[in-house]
């Protein structure tokens, strides 16, 4: 059957955890992405900013994960009102921000 | 001000009952989860259990699950402790914790009472 | 259950930096709190949600949390820093809250 939405925002936290402990090298070679607002929709916002990062093994699972949190389908090029169009981070930052709100998320129980 | 204050520790044989109480004053109580925390003499703190902001779900630690009962009465802003089956290792101070209410019980401890005494000896 | 390891002291001059560690497996999946117990005393919270630090709390007081291992940074060292220091996390699998071993803050 389906992943519980509490189970599903659980195994894509312990995912971020993964891939930000395992480099040993600049995740995805420090490439940049737009940052987004950590509002509602964030999970289609984060997917659209990470879905333009190219050639990167270390955050596929996490795109793929992202996408079923995501209503709509995402291509690469596509973007939101919720990204800070002037605000580039790298990666990794990226994911460290983004991995402490999903944590406070999964804490409040928002599990979709 | 916001404060907890506890009372009810003493000193217990070993197979008795003891019932702790903490007061709570200066904010809205049934807001809040609850908890109670301990520390045997020279040792580090213990997790005890926890109570809902409305009393709707306990969870305790496996030490005392089936001896300890946290309660708590938001009409009055009290939290209470009822201890059966008491051992020699339960002796500590026991602290009454509040932390905000989410979800989960994940969290901080944002205001701790002094703590009262328990001793279980025979 | 899940065990939270701290080692049991640290020692700093001070003026320096202390550095007390948590570790856990996967760690950095969970919302890790920071106490700080002097003697006699109630513990007091000094950092929240991996890194946040209470209002009350000076800037000096820092924390991080990635992979397996919290840490919890003291800048610039004062005496009155010494004092046990635990750190928190909630074990959402067991519906548990566990603390570590506390760590023993001496300032030389």
């Known amino acids: 059957g389906p992943v519980p939405p509490s189970t599903a925002l659980r195994e894509l936290i312990e995912e971020l955890v993964n891939i930000t402990q395992n480099q040993k090298a600049p995740l995805c070679n420090g490439s940049m992405v737009w940052s987004i607002n950590l509002t509602a929709g964030m999970y289609c916002a984060a997917l659209e900013s990470l879905i333009n990062v190219s050639g990167c093994s270390a955050i596929e699972k996490t795109q793929r994960m992202l996408s079923g949190f995501c209503p709509h389908k995402v291509s690469a090029g596509q973007f939101s009102s919720l990204h800070v169009r002037d605000t580039k981070i790298e990666v990794a930052q990226f994911v460290k921000d983004l991995l402490l709100h999903l944590k406070k998320l999964f804490r409040e129980g928002q599990f979709n | 001000q916001m404060q907890l204050v506890e009372s009810g520790g003493g000193v217990v044989q070993p197979g008795r009952s003891l019932t702790l109480s903490c007061a709570a004053s200066g904010f809205e109580f049934r807001t809040y989860g609850m908890h109670w925390v301990r520390q045997a003499p020279g040792k580090g703190l213990e997790w005890v259990a926890v109570?809902?902001?409305?009393?709707?779900?306990?969870h305790y630690a496996d030490s005392v699950k089936g001896r300890f009962t946290i309660t708590r009465d938001n009409s009055k802003n009290t939290l209470n402790l009822q201890m059966n089956s008491l051992r020699v290792e339960d002796t500590a101070v026991y602290y009454c914790?509040?932390?905000?209410?989410?979800?989960?019980?994940?969290?901080?401890?944002?205001?701790w009472g002094q703590g009262t005494m328990v001793t279980v000896s025979s | 259950s899940y065990i939270l390891t701290q080692p049991p002291s640290v020692s700093v001059a001070p003026g320096e930096t202390a550095t007390i560690t948590c570790g856990g497996n996967l760690i950095g999946a969970k919302l890790v709190h920071w106490y700080q117990q002097k003697p006699g005393q109630a513990p007091v919270l000094v950092i929240y949600d991996d890194s946040d630090r209470p209002s009350r709390i000076p800037e000096r007081f820092s924390g991080s949390n990635s992979g397996n291992t919290a840490t919890l940074t003291i800048s610039d060292v004062e005496e009155g820093d010494e004092a046990d220091y635990y750190c928190q996390v909630w074990d959402y699998y067991a519906d548990t809250m566990v603390f570590g071993g506390g760590t023993k803050l001496t300032v030389l």
């Open positions: 914790v509040r932390a905000p209410q989410w979800y989960l019980t994940a969290e901080a401890f944002d205001l």
């Open positions: 109570i809902w902001d409305d009393g709707s779900n306990t």
